[in-house]
Interface confidence: low
């Protein structure tokens, strides 16, 4: 069937249109296009005949219209009033006509809208505001987009006038946003420039801040005003009643007792007449004096002396406070508080008591610190210790000896060799020593304070000859797998070299032995029962050598799973069983039996004569080193026949 | 704008623990003494704790001292209350305060700037 389709439906003015011919017939004399619904001479647009390809324009032929071989019409430059229907009227080569009509519609390219307000500056709460969208257009529908979201859903929101006014009643402030209009027709759509809402509001009641309504004497009061309004809001302050500014912050420096009062901040909004008031009570307090500390005893002797720390000026009503440290009190049977916390006395003072102490006094508004003391504690002198620590010196060296002993004050030092009194210096110097120079070297350590002395004892052997070392280990039973030893050759003496075998032979290379302190120190990490060798240390200088007596490592280890003799499990009804249980171990370990889970005896051997069938079943040894602490154990199955 | 805004708070059984956090921002928090306070329901808003601006010194209210521990970490803007052995008693609205130098404070007067609080709940 012969149908137009128009392309497109919806045509802008100015635009062009297609009108479509769909299943044309064949065999055609020609075709001729009408405007209207009917074929009408006066109105035909343009005739084509197909044998002459002519087209001849009719009386409605407006010069915008083209004819396709197709029969398919193109129309330019469309204008209003092209709306409307057309007919194509088809004449067969056979004298039989056939028609069909299409349609479209012309609507015009819509302007960008704009917006329109009866009131610029609505007040909140009041004022009711409505916007009309311009211009007003025929076959436009109108839409309304607030912040760039479609309109919500409100009672105090009213579309009228066919969408094309919005109207807010009683306008907030929070109705202050953005406003857009939109025109749409089926060939165009066009938004407007935003309009924001004006909305004036306030003053609400001020806020005062700071929160706090109390000071010091002497602190500076500084109070902000602020009152949520539009326009801003105009600020006085009022103390007491009386006016004193008009500015949003009030500052009093360095307030006094005097200053205690009212204060009120007035906000005024001139746009919208009202005015709003806050008012806070400020109490200003008088300044306490600052803490001081006092002792008892400014230089205390260790161990001996007590302290008595007091925290000044006495105050009533008033709490003290106490820290050490920076930190507060530590519980300590040697710290003790009086009733009214105001004396700290400290009993047997020690030199880690130096401090600082601090004091503070505290009223219901603050706390206030005194300036920290630190007490002189008189303690020591400790036992002092000589350096180096060398025993064995060659002929001709210096012997230079340095002795030092915690000590406050610090100490005073003598030397004494063999009981004489050499000098009174914390270094003693001998050049180019001796044979004769061998013997017992004493430091002695004064504290002139406390009135008390300390001692040390050194000897010192000058010879040509090194003596025979020894070796000292920090563990004598150390434990597989678990433990470290560490052996040193004793003594440790000047320009030496130590030298260091095991079973006779020099250390081999392992990541788990390390030598240190100058060779020294040899340290055998994570030993094993393979460890328990021969240890030997030498000692020697370019005139003489020295090997020390071997040193046996006793490596504890074990228990391993033991093993359980004959390895038989089968027997005949009437032979004797005698099971032997062996596991490595140092030290030995301890045996024990189960059979079938049920304890025997504590022996290395089991023996059962004459066995019957009676006798099947599981065989446990059980083995434990109480040195190691560990413990293994083995099962075997033993079947009697009959 | 100066804000504190506290974290941490929740329902604990007697004998539990808590750690409160308070977020400080728009000031200078290494110059402000930091406070605790607490209100529990138709009672006035009490002191808790205090710790002065370089965290030397702490205060404590006695019926805390011993079970909660202030600190701060000025790098951080945060101060931190520490409470162990939580009693019934401790149920409250606990707030952070801060206030700017001088000696501190024991009471809610002379603190500047508050939060909004953070919800303490101790039952079994």
């Known amino acids: 069937k012969l149908t137009i389709e128009s392309t497109p439906f919806n045509v802008a003015e100015g635009k062009e249109v297609l009108l479509l011919v769909h299943n044309l017939p064949q065999h055609l004399f020609g075709y001729s296009w009408y405007k209207g619904e009917r074929v009408d001479g006066n109105r035909q647009i343009i005739g084509y005949v197909i044998g002459t390809q002519q087209a001849t324009p009719g009386p409605a032929y407006s010069g915008r219209e083209i004819i396709y071989p197709n029969a398919s019409l193109l129309i330019q430059n469309i204008i209003q009033n092209d709306t409307g229907f057309y007919t194509l009227h088809v004449i067969k080569s056979d004298l039989v006509n056939e028609e069909a009509t299409g349609q479209f519609r012309v609507y015009p390219e819509l302007p960008k809208p704009s917006i329109s307000s009866n009131n610029s500056k609505p007040v909140e709460d009041k004022d009711a505001v409505a916007f009309t969208c311009e211009p007003e257009t025929q076959d436009a529908t109108y839409l309304w987009w607030v912040n760039n979201q479609s309109l919500p859903v409100s009672p105090r929101l009213q579309l009228s006038n066919g969408n094309r006014t919005l109207t807010l009643f009683n306008v907030t402030r929070n109705d202050t946003a953005s406003y857009k209009c939109e025109t749409q027709n089926p060939v165009s759509a066009r938004r407007s420039d935003s309009v924001i809402l004006n909305v004036l509001y306030g003053p609400d009641a001020p806020t005062i801040s700071p929160l706090n309504t109390s000071y010091r004497s002497g602190e500076n009061l500084n109070l902000s005003c602020h009152a949520a309004s539009n326009p801003p809001a105009q600020y006085s302050w009022f103390v007491n009643g009386t006016f004193q500014q008009s500015t949003q912050e009030l500052f009093i420096p360095n307030i006094t007792v005097n200053n205690s009062g009212s204060y009120t901040c007035q906000a005024h909004n001139s746009d919208t007449g009202l005015n709003r008031t806050t008012v806070t009570t400020i109490t200003v307090y008088a300044e306490p004096p600052k803490p001081f500390i006092t002792s008892n005893n400014s230089n205390p002797v260790e161990d001996e002396d007590a302290v008595a720390l007091t925290c000044e000026p006495e105050i009533q009503n008033t709490t003290y406070l106490w820290w050490v440290n920076n930190q507060s009190l530590p519980v300590s049977p040697r710290l003790q508080l009086s009733n009214d916390n105001r004396t700290l006395t400290l009993l047997s003072v020690t030199r880690n008591d130096v401090g600082p102490y601090e004091c503070g006094i505290q009223n219901e508004l603050s706390v206030d610190h005194s300036d920290p003391v630190i007490l002189n504690v008189l303690y020591g002198p400790d036992d002092p210790t000589i350096s180096p620590s060398y025993t064995y010196y060659r002929p001709g060296v210096n012997l230079s000896l340095s002795c030092h002993a915690a000590s406050n004050p610090p100490a005073q030092y003598s030397w004494l060799i063999d009981g004489n009194i050499q000098q009174h210096t914390q270094e003693l110097f001998i050049s180019n020593i001796t044979e004769k120079n061998s013997g017992l070297y004493t430091c002695q350590a004064n504290n002139s304070a406390s009135g008390h002395s300390r001692t040390t004892v050194k000897t010192i052997t000058v010879s040509a000859e090194l003596p025979k070392p020894s070796i000292s280990s920090n563990n004598s039973k150390p434990v597989e797998d678990k433990d470290a030893v560490a052996f040193t050759c004793e003594p440790e003496a000047q320009n030496t070299t130590y030298l260091w075998w095991v079973n006779g032979q020099s250390l081999p290379v392992s990541p788990r032995l390390q030598l240190s302190n100058g060779n020294r120190t040899l340290t055998l990490f994570n030993v094993t029962r393979n460890d328990a060798r021969a240890y030997v240390c030498g000692i020697q200088n370019s005139v003489s050598a020295n090997r020390s007596d071997p040193v046996t490592l006793d490596v504890l280890y074990g228990p391993d799973t033991p093993i359980i003799s004959p390895p038989d499990s089968s027997y005949l009804s009437g032979a004797n069983l005698n099971l032997s249980c062996h596991s490595a171990s140092n030290p030995s370990p301890q045996y024990s039996w189960r059979i079938n889970g049920i304890p025997q005896q504590h022996t290395q051997v089991l023996f059962i004569a004459k066995i019957t069938p009676n006798n099947n079943g599981t065989y446990a040894c059980f083995v434990s080193n109480l040195a190691t602490g560990r413990n293994n154990s083995i099962v075997k199955s033993i079947t009697v026949s009959a | 704008e100066v804000q504190l805004v506290e974290s941490g708070g929740g329902v604990v059984q007697p004998g539990g623990s808590l750690r409160l956090s308070c977020a400080a921002s728009?000031?200078?928090?290494?110059?402000?003494?930091m406070g605790w306070f607490r209100q529990a329901p138709g009672k006035e808003r009490e002191f808790v704790a205090a710790?002065?601006?370089?965290?030397?010194?702490?205060y404590y209210a006695d019926s805390v001292r011993g079970r909660f521990t202030i600190s701060r970490d000025n790098a951080k803007n945060t101060v931190y209350l520490q409470m162990n052995s939580l009693r019934p008693e401790d149920t409250a609205l606990y707030y952070c305060?801060?206030?700017?130098?001088?000696?501190?404070?024991?009471?809610?007067?002379?603190?500047?700037?508050w939060g909004q609080g953070t919800l303490v709940t101790v039952s079994s």
């Open positions: 728009g000031l200078t928090f290494s110059t402000y003494t």
């Open positions: 305060a801060a206030q700017h130098f001088g000696p501190i404070g024991l009471t809610t007067r002379g603190y500047h700037y």
């Open positions: 710790i002065i601006w370089s965290g030397s010194n702490t």
